[in-house]
């Protein structure tokens, strides 16, 4: 009986035309939502003039439907048993699941000012930038609508730069009508234990953002894992959002709509400093902001963002060192709300429910030659927003799953 089930599972989780896995893999049957909470800065003037702590107040959720588009350019390679694809990006605003509209205003860090002052460290160039910042009436902080902040706006300061630069700025710009990839993953035809594991991303087995093992593309994209998942396993996966591979460990047994699943969570150790977790040494890319690699809980992904000083963390700086959150008032981290988890059906390896949570932060540093940053006495890793991307198997699919998979085993 067990062997027959194993054989059936192995057949059905292969990523090729005609399998249950393939149908759901090409276009997810689960509704996926991405909720945003924006950190509205309450005291912009005090920060700019006196280098005060930044007082933030989160506003949200603002909810978008995402991952509703089918994978594109799906191409099987029979020779190396892989399938390649592009994952198109799309986001549709859901007013009924949001606290306001896309036209809501927020006071946030001026992304262009913070980024330009970081990218161009030469003092003379900073003086040029300063004159353009002043001319455009830009400041350290700005008021932007949700739509502008997420999807892009024409920046008045960058528009004055007399040589070719991208003048449109947005945390997720460009997004709609773009695609992530090309991903090339193993289809599992020759070896089911490799199914969905990424072979190459953008044609490479490495990212070129990190040193050593940190640069590797490990595991799957977290939508599924090879079947017959054990509680003792460490599940590796790659997330292009955070420009790195990461891992999840078993936390607990969960019953999801009558289906027994394993809850895997991202452990605090994954965000630890190299002092506590030596494996993380290669995620420490500079010595000053990281206080000689002793800070933890924030990931500098500037190399992956054309030099813009973007730092990824968990929401509200969960699992981050006190020095990171010290200059920010108004944060309340808690595991239940702010950690990432994956609920995996162990027989198939399918992720039936997940909550991916992350926070986007921007570094802003004092600058002698940029007037609006001149009075700063310290570096700030400024939270801009945090997001919660969730998906749960639908009732209909859960019934089908119970009858065809877990029901047969039990």
């Amino acid at each position: 009986g067990d062997l027959l089930i194993q054989k059936t599972i192995k057949k059905q989780v292969v990523l090729e035309e005609g399998t249950i896995a393939f149908k759901n893999w090409v276009k997810t049957g689960t509704e996926v939502y991405r909720q945003f909470w924006i950190f509205d800065v309450q005291n912009p003037q005090e920060v700019m003039m006196n280098s005060s702590n930044i007082q933030v107040k989160q506003r949200g959720p603002y909810t978008y439907r995402v991952r509703f588009l089918a994978k594109e350019n799906v191409t099987q390679d029979a020779e190396d048993n892989t399938v390649s694809f592009l994952q198109p990006n799309g986001a549709i605003f859901e007013p009924s699941l949001s606290v306001g509209t896309e036209a809501d205003n927020f006071t946030v860090l001026n992304l262009a000012v913070a980024a330009a002052s970081h990218i161009y460290q030469n003092q003379f160039v900073q003086m040029i930038l300063n004159s353009l910042i002043n001319k455009s009436k830009s400041s350290m902080f700005q008021v932007r609508t949700l739509r502008e902040l997420l999807w892009g706006y024409r920046d008045p300061f960058l528009s004055l730069v007399p040589y070719p630069v991208t003048t449109t700025v947005g945390l997720f710009y460009p997004y709609n009508n773009t695609a992530d990839g090309v991903y090339k993953v193993f289809n599992g035809k020759d070896n089911i234990s490799k199914v969905a594991i990424i072979d190459t991303y953008k044609g490479k087995r490495n990212l070129s953002y990190w040193e050593s093992h940190c640069d590797m593309i490990n595991g799957t994209d977290a939508a599924s894992f090879p079947p017959f998942v054990e509680k003792s396993q460490v599940l590796q996966f790659f997330s292009s959002d955070i420009c790195r591979s990461i891992y999840a460990v078993f936390e607990s047994d969960v019953n999801l709509k009558g289906i027994p699943v394993y809850r895997f969570v991202l452990p605090s150790k994954a965000f630890a400093s190299p002092v506590e977790n030596p494996d993380n040494y290669c995620f420490c890319t500079e010595k000053i902001i990281s206080k000689n690699c002793t800070s933890y809980g924030v990931l500098d992904i500037s190399k992956c963002k054309e030099g813009r000083p973007v730092y990824i963390s968990l929401p509200h700086f969960l699992y981050a060192s006190p020095d990171v959150s010290e200059p920010i008032d108004g944060l309340n981290p808690n595991e239940e709300e702010h950690r990432t988890y994956l609920d995996i059906e162990p027989i198939t390896g399918f992720t039936l429910q997940f909550a991916k949570r992350l926070q986007v932060n921007l570094l802003v540093k004092p600058s002698e030659k940029i007037q609006v940053l001149k009075n700063l006495k310290r570096n700030y890793i400024v939270p801009i927003l945090w997001l919660n991307e969730t998906g749960t198997i639908g009732d209909e699919k859960a019934n089908m799953f119970r009858s065809q998979v877990t029901g047969k085993i039990n």
């Epitope: 030469n122 003092q123 003379f124 040029i128 300063n130 007399p162 040589y163 002698e368 001149k374």
Partner: antibody, heavy 115, light 107 residues
Framework: EVQLVQSGAEVKKPGSSVKVSCKAS????????MQWVRQAPGQGLEWMGG????????AYAQKFQGRVTLTADKSTSTAYMELSSLRSEDTAVYYC????????WGQGTLVTVSS | ETTVTQSPAFMSATTGDKVTISCITS??????MNWYQQKPGEPPKLLIS???TLRPGVPSRFSSSGYGTDFTFTINNIESEDAAYYYC?????????FGQGTKLEIK
């Protein structure tokens, strides 16, 4: 040893243009910006503008905007200053000088504008 | 634009004397003031850069002080070779601006 060597003296007619070169050696050219300063006979120093060879960032003094063009050739470690629509009051010694604090200077290029 | 007012325009001193030159700026420039010496037929030479930093090889009799808008350049124990023009330059903001210069004559 850091050296900035400028092109030789020029005599120009009013309305014409002059292009002064400044060849740098002894350091990595793109690491520092090049500034240009002029000094009319018996007068003080006047900043004209600067260029950062790394980014191509340029700033000009308002007085010279539209008449001066600064360029930099990283392959030859040479900066250039071109001044157009010359008039007699442009007669001066033109200096290239490195960095924001003008730590090293070229020997100067005398440009005489005379009909 | 930050204007720089330098005074005096001319001064005479005897070897061994102490002299001071003043530069006042129209805006707050922190400590971004530089001081230069120029002798006839030569390019200017940087003596003191931002933050009153004495350049390597420059004798310690040259010094400067000041912050914000008021700056002072001092030569202690003057020597005959110090006869020259002296200029201040603010490097805080664009356009970079010089003082009008001070001619120091040694009697």
């Amino acid at each position: 040893e850091v050296q900035l060597v400028q092109s030789g003296a020029e005599v120009k007619k009013p309305g014409s243009s002059v292009k002064v070169s400044c060849k740098a050696s002894g350091y990595r050219f793109s690491d520092y910006e090049m500034q240009w300063v002029r000094q009319a006979p018996g007068q003080g120093l006047e900043w004209m503008g600067g260029i950062d060879p790394e980014t191509g960032g340029i700033a000009y003094a308002q007085k010279f905007q539209g008449r001066v063009t600064l360029t930099a050739d990283k392959s030859t470690s040479t900066a250039y200053m071109e001044l157009s629509s010359l008039r007699s009051e442009d007669t001066a010694v033109y200096y290239c000088t490195r960095k924001l604090d003008f730590d090293y200077w070229g020997q100067g290029t005398l440009v005489t504008v005379s009909s | 634009e930050t204007t720089v007012t330098q005074s005096p325009a001319f001064m005479s001193a005897t070897t061994g004397d102490k002299v001071t030159i003043s530069c006042i700026t129209s805006t707050d420039i922190d400590d971004d003031m530089n001081w230069y010496q120029q002798k006839p037929g030569e390019p200017p030479k940087l003596l003191i850069s931002e933050g009153s930093t004495l350049r390597p090889g420059v004798p310690s009799r040259f010094s400067s002080s000041g912050y914000g808008t008021d700056f002072t350049f001092t030569i202690n124990n003057i020597e005959s070779e110090d006869a020259a023009y002296y200029y201040c330059l603010q490097s805080d903001n664009l356009p970079l601006t010089f003082g009008q210069g001070t001619k120091l004559e040694i009697k």
